[in-house]
């Protein structure tokens, strides 16, 4: 029966049992960002802590160079939130000066990169029209979902604007991934 | 080494196989909240349910005096909602009065406290500001993520203001977490 | 005992172990909806997309009409997240006209379905009061948590105005749940 | 420009604890954006890693499993610095001593160091 | 710990060549992988970062390269002012570790 386990004793070849300490896992933490150049229409990723304070990364979870690498297939429950600060966004300096009232955004996505695929692909978004009536406005956007990955995808953070990005404190800015 | 784990293969000896029902699990519900003194640079923590509804805590997850009990040294998701609720914020009272425009806002931390540390640590903060235009408003700030935890280690959820809580219902305000 | 569980040391007997691969998961993405009648005080529940694209039901995890079917039972992890979209809320055009403020407001509520029992019961909730001053307006809310499920509870996500929900992209809106 | 300044006596003998002071200036000790380190050099290790302290949530401290029994580090923000202290020294711990900043960002490096101090540990 | 390898552990070469230092990782950490110039009396200097950036101040002559476990320091045209011992060092890890230096020499 394949959700039920009174199991023959061979059945192990087929889906192993294992340890959960053993299983790739990580929580990353944010850190200064560095301006860098980017396609015009595409979303600057974010750099990541992987050791210092509460980050870390594990058995065979590996952080290099933006990307989480994933290094055994399987399901994984994926999160990030991003905590953006600005001053008065232009939505209502454009309201005030009585032209027509586009909002600004904030947005973040939790993309895959297959080599073996040519795009990326937009595993989580979140966006957020931003028109703010304070001066000074700051806000996060939390994502988290199961995605079925293979091993040797990447996963990455993007953000519409680095720039707006609060960096300041760990707890405040995060991505991680694990195993189920 | 923190960062990396490149196990042997019979790391099954440290790591033994546990059947998943008897994880340490816990989630928690918004109930009433009694104003409580609190030190000025210091977020109120929010007392919970643990029993009553959908409140449950199971396999020695312990709930006491506002804190999660940690049984057991592990990595755990961690997770928390809380649902804010007011009348117009300070924020455009201000603004209607042309004094400077700062923005209120609401804060929700998961903080750990370990015997033998004695500062607390913040794991997750969801913050916001609010500055709203409509009279009554509400809203909600959502965490989660994983951690690793030790025995004996205790977990609370704070927020800036108690008062502004909504305790209504517990599907709005909540707080959990489990072994991974 | 709900609360506690100071198990004996054989508990394996009743709780075998058992592969992870093997688990009921499913993550489910948007679709277009078509609008359907509800009774007055009774959000209107999602359709799902189940097998497309980032999509998937696996292990007797099944959605059939709005619904998750919870094959086996158990703790699971419970999460969706709804994008909203809509032009200027009615709360600015009412304050606009001098009528008194009451904000309009966006709700998500994760809702379980026992046969046994006569009433849903709503896990999840996040609502937020939308009183946007720029003409176009959009936002996440995102909802996790962890329930007790039973072998035959049904789960849904009804949403406060299923035509402000934003079905453009599946990485925007998602329904998922696991076994732990 | 960020300068540190390193102070602490010249000679340690044997068995005694060796105390150094590293005074930052041009940044803060409680900088999210660093960790403050102890290094030392000896014509027989070369050079070696021995500790560091940071602030991120709280304080956090690593040793190097060498001397992690007998160093610590402690900050000091009221003074903008912090320090070394290394029980139970003996010959082998003679070495050039050197704080140094590591600037964590997209990358990390140890970019702005100490003097150095010289310590013989000899009775 | 990580093992950094360096070589040559020293060599001797002439104003204007060419100069090449390799290291070598114990184990792959992408380009978290930092070079330094230490000159006698001196504590050492940030060179290169990230494997391949130069460090403000620091003469164009100077480049690095490599990701992995292999990387390279190339002096391009040696300076009498270049006369130092050059360092490569992880910070993926920790702890931080260092190769044991080459010591460069003018003919």
């Known amino acids: 029966l394949k959700g039920q386990e009174f199991a023959p004793s061979h059945q192990q070849v087929y889906a192993p049992l294992r340890a959960d300490g053993d299983k790739p896992r990580a929580h990353l933490t944010v850190v200064r960002q560095t301006p860098t150049q980017h396609f015009k229409n595409q979303f600057p990723a974010l750099h990541w802590e992987h050791e210092l304070g509460l980050a870390f990364t594990k058995n065979r979870m590996n952080y290099t160079n933006k990307f989480l690498l994933i290094p055994e297939s399987g399901d994984y429950f994926i999160y990030s939130q991003v905590t953006f600060r600005g001053m008065t966004s232009e939505c209502s300096e454009i309201r005030q000066a009585g032209r027509p009232n586009k909002p600004d955004s904030i947005t973040v996505v939790i993309t895959k990169v297959t080599d073996s695929y040519p795009e990326p692909t937009q595993l989580l978004m979140g966006t957020k029209s931003v028109c703010e009536v304070g001066s000074n406005w700051f806000q996060p956007i939390y994502l988290g979902a199961m995605f079925s990955l293979q091993e040797g995808d990447k996963l990455m953070v993007n953000v519409s604007d680095i720039s707006l990005v609060d960096y300041t404190k760990e707890d405040k800015t995060f991505f991680g991934a694990f195993l189920l | 080494l923190k960062g990396q784990e490149f196990a042997p293969s019979h790391q099954q000896v440290y790591a033994p196989l546990r059947a998943d029902g008897d994880k340490p699990r816990a989630h928690l519900t918004v109930v009433r909240q009694t104003p409580t003194q609190h030190f000025k640079n210091q977020f109120p923590a929010l007392h919970w349910e643990h029993e009553l509804g959908l409140a449950f805590t199971k396999n020695r997850m312990n709930y006491t005096n506002k804190f999660l009990l940690i049984p057991e040294s592990g990595d755990y998701f961690i997770y928390s909602q809380v649902t804010f609720r007011g009348m117009t914020s300070e924020c455009s009272e201000i603004r209607q009065a042309g004094r400077p425009n700062k923005p209120d806002s609401i804060t929700v931390v998961i903080t750990k406290v370990t015997d033998s540390y004695p500062e607390p640590t913040q794991l997750l903060m969801g913050t916001k500001s609010v500055c709203e235009v409509g009279s009554n408003w509400f809203q909600p700030i959502y965490l989660g993520a994983m951690f690793s935890l030790q025995e004996g280690d205790k977990l609370m959820v704070n927020v800036s203001d108690i008062s502004l809580v909504d305790y209504t219902k517990e599907d709005k305000t909540f707080f959990g977490a489990f072994l991974l | 005992l709900k609360g506690q569980e100071f198990a004996p040391s054989h508990q394996q007997v009743y709780a075998p172990l058992r592969a992870d691969g093997d688990k009921p998961r499913a993550h489910l993405t948007v679709v277009r909806q078509t609008p359907t009648q509800h009774f007055k005080n009774q959000f209107p529940a999602l359709h799902w997309e189940h097998e497309l694209g980032l999509a998937f039901t696996k292990n007797r995890m099944n959605y059939t009409n709005k619904f998750l079917l919870i094959p086996e039972s158990g703790d699971y992890f419970i999460y969706s997240q709804v994008t909203f979209r809509g032009m200027t809320s009615e709360c600015s055009e009412i304050r606009q006209a001098g009528r008194p403020n009451k904000p309009d407001s966006i709700t998500v509520v994760i809702t379980k379905v026992t046969d046994s029992y006569p009433e849903p019961t709503q896990l999840l909730m996040g609502t937020k009061s939308v009183c946007e001053v720029g003409s176009n307006w959009f936002q996440p809310i995102y909802l996790g948590a962890m329930f007790s499920l039973q072998e035959g509870d049904k789960l849904m996500v009804n949403v406060s105005d299923i035509s402000l929900v934003d079905y453009t992209k599946e990485d925007k809106t998602f329904f998922g749940a696991f076994l732990l | 420009q960020v300068q540190l300044q390193q102070s602490g006596p010249g000679l340690v003998k044997p068995s005694q604890t060796l105390s150094l002071t590293c005074a930052i200036s041009?940044?803060?000790?409680?900088?999210?954006?660093?960790?403050w380190n102890w290094i030392r050099q000896s014509p027989s290790r070369g050079l070696e890693w021995l500790g560091r302290?940071?602030?991120?949530?709280?304080?956090?401290?690593d040793y190097a499993v060498s001397v992690k029994s007998r160093l610590t580090i402690n900050p000091d923000t009221s003074k903008n610095q912090f320090s070394l202290q290394l029980n139970s020294v003996t010959p082998e711990d003679t070495a050039v001593y050197y704080c140094?900043?590591?600037?964590?960002?997209?990358?990390?490096?140890?970019?702005?160091w100490g003097q150095g101090t010289l310590v013989p540990v000899s009775s | 710990d990580i093992q950094m390898t360096q070589s040559p552990s020293s060599l001797s070469a002439s104003v204007g060549d060419r100069v090449t230092i390799t290291c070598r990782a114990s184990q792959s950490f992408s380009s978290y992988l930092n070079w330094y110039q230490q000159t006698p009396g001196k504590a050492p200097k940030l060179l290169i970062y990230a494997a391949s950036s130069l460090q403000s101040g620091v003469p164009s002559r100077f480049s690095g390269s490599g990701s992995g476990t292999y990387f390279t320091l190339t002096i391009s045209s040696l300076q009498p002012e270049d006369l130092a011992t050059y360092y490569c060092?992880?910070?993926?890890?920790?702890?931080?570790?260092f190769g044991q230096g080459t010591k460069v020499e003018i003919k």
């Open positions: 140094a900043r590591e600037a964590v960002g997209p990358t990390k490096d140890f970019d702005y």
């Open positions: 041009g940044d803060s000790v409680s900088s999210n954006s660093a960790t």
């Open positions: 302290t940071y602030y991120r949530s709280k304080w956090y401290n």
């Open positions: 060092q992880q910070s993926y890890f920790t702890p931080r570790t």
